[in-house]
């Protein structure tokens, strides 16, 4: 038979950050290859990563067509060297992925502090708006374009000379905070989607940026 000694894939897992979305699975193939199919609940199956010896498949191009849909994928196992033939009627072994809803489940990527500027006892901290692979009219959209007011940022800031952290929140990409004159401060930001109730609610913290380094500017 055409599928003798092929093993069904298992541990199908979605890995997604800022909508860049890859399906991973096991096992590493021995004398077999894989083809992936993806579909929305109401749509047709679309094949991707044909006869690959990899154990991952980048499905970003499919899910960014509608990040608010729920997707299902499946991985078919074929003997190595398999060539599609019209006469084959036997369905190869396959495994279904968990459902995946990008808007609710994609992880938030690590944010970056774009700049900070001190004017007297105020500091304006700006977070860089990350680009995604989601498009509108052939233009790539930013994370803010996709999530809008669902996305907030938390700023952690502290005096360079102490460890006591303060926090601020914004639903824009800017913070305006009060600081003590003559003190240097360090900053880190985190992206948050408050409406989420799961572990992917928050990003990892951005790299720390401190006053007195190149990203900052000071004016009296």
């Amino acid at each position: 038979s055409g599928t003798t000694n092929t093993v069904a894939a298992y541990n199908l897992t979605w890995k997604s950050t800022n909508f860049k979305t890859i399906l991973e699975w096991e096992p590493k193939p021995i004398n077999q290859v894989y083809t992936v199919q993806i579909s929305t609940k109401s749509g047709d199956w679309k094949s991707k990563c044909f006869y690959t010896a990899d154990t991952e498949c980048d499905l970003t191009d499919e899910i960014v067509k509608d990040v608010k849909q729920t997707y299902l994928a499946r991985v078919f196992s074929y003997p190595a060297g398999h060539v599609e033939s019209t006469g084959s009627t036997e369905e190869p072994p396959y495994e279904n992925s968990p459902e995946f809803t990008p808007y609710l489940e994609t992880n938030l990527g690590q944010p970056t502090i774009q700049s900070f500027e001190q004017v007297g006892t105020k500091v304006n901290v700006t977070v860089q708006d990350e680009w995604t692979l989601v498009r509108r009219n052939d233009t790539f959209l930013s994370l803010r374009d996709v999530f809008g007011k669902d996305l907030i940022y938390t700023l952690y800031y502290w005096k360079s000379s102490s460890s006591g952290k303060k926090t601020a929140k914004t639903n824009t990409n800017e913070f305006l905070i009060d600081v003590d004159k003559g003190e240097n401060y360090c900053f880190s930001v985190q992206a948050v989607i408050p409406s989420r109730r799961t572990a992917n609610r928050k990003s990892t913290d951005s790299p720390v940026e401190c006053m007195g380094h190149e990203k900052g500017e000071s004016r009296e």
Partner: antibody
Framework: EVQLVQSGAEVKKPGESLRISCKGS????????IEWVRQMPGKGLEWMGD????????NYNENFKGHVTISADKSISTAYLQWSSLKASDTAMYYC?????????????WGQGTLVTVSS | DIVMTQSPLSLPVTPGEPASISCKSS????????????LTWYLQKPGQSPQLLIY???TRESGVPDRFSGSGSGTDFTLKISRVEAEDVGVYYC?????????FGQGTKLEIK
Amino acid sequence: EVQLVQSGAEVKKPGESLRISCKGSGYTFITYWIEWVRQMPGKGLEWMGDILPGSGSTNYNENFKGHVTISADKSISTAYLQWSSLKASDTAMYYCARSGYYGNSGFAYWGQGTLVTVSS
Amino acid sequence: DIVMTQSPLSLPVTPGEPASISCKSSQSLLSSGNQKNYLTWYLQKPGQSPQLLIYWASTRESGVPDRFSGSGSGTDFTLKISRVEAEDVGVYYCQNDYTYPLTFGQGTKLEIK
């Protein structure tokens, strides 16, 4: 085709409880905010609050907080607006609406409205 | 809360003539991250539910005639109708879609002269 279908008109007495509904179809219900908007007779639009059915997360206008409750049952693609004790001043048309696809892109689809009349 | 103020409140227009409605917000609706203004316009025709016309201050919703256009940034916004038609009568609302609580203007009633 995206549709929001609201429950029918209600006539109630002050102090009574009420739950009105909004059933979504033609789209992935869990990923779009459902908004509730009040329009008192001859007046403008007032945003009451919203819910993201996928997580149950809600936001309320402080003017309505504590007086109404917004909920959703994603298994039947339906959102609800409820009162435990109605007042005459709750007499109004209530609309549900669905958020747009992009962030902060308005209320793209609206239900037909539910007229609530509260009178002794 | 962000207060939205529309003017005029009543706008009588002759068919074929242009019309303009102003909307001012008490705080900027410009998102620094993506430079979009989160200002939305709706039309509520007599006896109907409201309908979305414009979002992001100037992006026309699909199916909305191109005689409708939105402009402005920060706190000052304008909805223009290049040539008013009889079917355009109703109440026009602007809305802060930038931050909670979402707030509407008091409405501008457009009527045919």
